[in-house]
């Protein structure tokens, strides 16, 4: 997605994007919370590809681990959290049962904030 | 995705979240910045299923439409912005060839900064 | 700039090891797959083997299965290939190459020769 | 496995001339093939992928059509660096990734 600091913006939580393989994630949550397989290829006409995914989430060694950048810290604690979105993908379940069905992807780092109480 | 508010916590940027249809998106842009048709229908082994992409963006009615939440406003100017990822989708392009695509949607609201030069 | 430097080519003997490496940088390597692609001296392009992004995935060609081992190591930016029992037809340039989403090859190393030969 | 056939081998052209280069496929590959070029002591470049979508810094020169087993690379007007041999690969169904044999295009 496009970069913020390509304008002179910073973020409030540095975050890491990447494509990862359904070979490389194996598994994944659907929406009713049970676990599938992720199938390493999808079907097209006489053929197939590979199951791709688009993941960003928090980045662990950035500046913003510790906290979120920009936030008034005489008010606020904060944190930046990985949020996940739903995508439909190829996959198999625990009854060995194959369709598409979305399952949860981390797509975002965002930042979360708790009034502090006590000054 | 999990609600922060559920734990006694705020976002720094208000977002909503949708399901919408390939009958409503009707278009999209594909990885290489072209524009494409994105399909109602997926062929599956028996039959069609509707294709849906779930949505996340900025609330435009929200608290954060001004400037982020949390915000150091002494020292940052803030805004909540959109932010795309990428999901592979049934498309067909600008030479009615159908195929598997990646396109971009809209999946976080995230909090961007610049910093205030003068005082 | 995406870059890909191939080493560890050379001149072996029937049924001898060598192992082949490949520095990666220019981009976010664990997001790519990789593939080792030959070419025997006056031939075309033959595929070997091809690695997804976390080492999850891995796929040979069938003139080198079991006698060929390809890995990665993200933290180095490197990619390998192991090469066992090797034979004269295995003679030939070693290509590392990025593999798209799709499944061609955006980026070529320079190659390595490796020449088995008695 | 899909077997990739390039034809011709060799095409003896001048500068200014047309090339016309074919890859037909053993079964239909949807439009799921790439084309790539390789100078003497060089990689292969990629050209087209997609059938017919030219890769970053391509010129317009090369143009890549066809779908299904049938495909072709255009040159519309050889310059002196398009003389080299030319690859098509297909990525629809792997493993194993196939090439074509390649086409050799030399000055008449």
């Known amino acids: 997605h496009s970069d913020p600091a390509r304008r002179g913006e910073l973020s409030v939580c540095d975050s890491i994007s990447e494509w990862v393989t359904a070979a490389d994630k194996k598994t994944a949550v659907d929406m009713s919370g049970g676990t599938v397989t992720v199938l390493e290829k999808v079907p097209v006409s006489k053929g197939q590809l590979k199951q791709y995914f688009y993941e960003t989430k928090c980045n662990p060694m950035g500046y913003t681990k510790e906290g979120c950048r920009g936030i008034d810290k005489r008010h606020w604690n904060s944190q930046c959290r990985t949020t996940q979105s739903y995508v439909r993908a190829l996959t198999m379940d625990s009854k060995k049962r194959i369709g598409w069905r979305f399952i949860r992807i981390d797509t975002s780092c965002v930042c979360t904030l708790t009034i502090k109480r006590g000054r | 995705h999990s609600d922060p508010a559920r734990r006694g916590e705020l976002s720094v940027c208000d977002s909503i979240s949708e399901w919408v249809t390939a009958a409503d998106k009707k278009t999209a842009v594909d990885m290489s910045g072209g524009t494409v048709t994105v399909l109602e229908k997926v062929p599956v082994s028996k039959g069609q299923l509707k294709q849906y992409f779930y949505e996340t963006k900025c609330n435009p009615m929200g608290y954060t439409k001004e400037g982020c939440r949390g915000i150091d406003k002494r020292h940052w100017n803030s805004q909540c912005r959109t932010t795309q990822s990428y999901v592979r989708a049934l498309t067909m392009d600008s030479k009615k060839r159908i195929g598997w695509r990646f396109i971009r949607i809209d999946t976080s609201c995230v909090c961007t900064l610049t910093i205030k030069r003068g005082r | 700039d995406v870059q890909l430097v191939e080493s560890g080519g050379g001149v072996v003997r029937p049924g001898e090891s060598l192992r082949l490496s490949c520095a990666a940088s220019?981009?976010?390597?664990?997001?790519?797959?990789m593939n080792w692609v030959r070419q025997a001296p006056g031939e075309g392009l033959e595929w070997v083997s091809g690695i997804s992004g976390r080492g999850g995935g891995i796929y040979y060609a069938d003139s080198v299965k079991g006698r060929f081992t390809i890995s990665r190591d993200n933290s180095k930016n490197t990619l390998y290939l192991q090469m066992n029992s090797l034979r004269a037809e295995d003679t030939a340039i070693y290509y590392c190459?990025?593999?798209?989403?799709?499944?061609?090859?955006?980026?070529w190393g320079l190659g390595t020769l490796v020449t088995v030969s008695s | 496995e899909i077997v990739l056939t390039q034809s011709p081998g060799t095409l003896s052209l001048s500068p200014g001339e047309r090339a016309t280069l074919s890859c037909r496929a053993s079964?239909?590959?949807?439009?799921?093939l790439a084309w790539y070029q390789q100078k003497p002591g060089q990689a292969p470049r990629l050209l087209i992928y997609d059938a017919s979508t030219r890769a970053a810094g391509i010129p317009a020169r090369f143009r890549g059509s066809g779908s299904g087993t049938e495909f072709t690379l255009t040159i519309s007007s050889l310059q002196s660096e398009d003389f080299a041999v030319y690859y098509c690969q297909q990525y629809n169904n792997w493993p194993p990734l196939t090439f074509g044999g390649g086409t050799k295009v030399e000055i008449k």
């Open positions: 220019g981009f976010t390597f664990t997001s790519y797959a």
């Open positions: 190459v990025r593999e798209t989403l799709n499944i061609f090859f955006d980026y």
């Open positions: 079964q239909a590959i949807n439009y799921y």
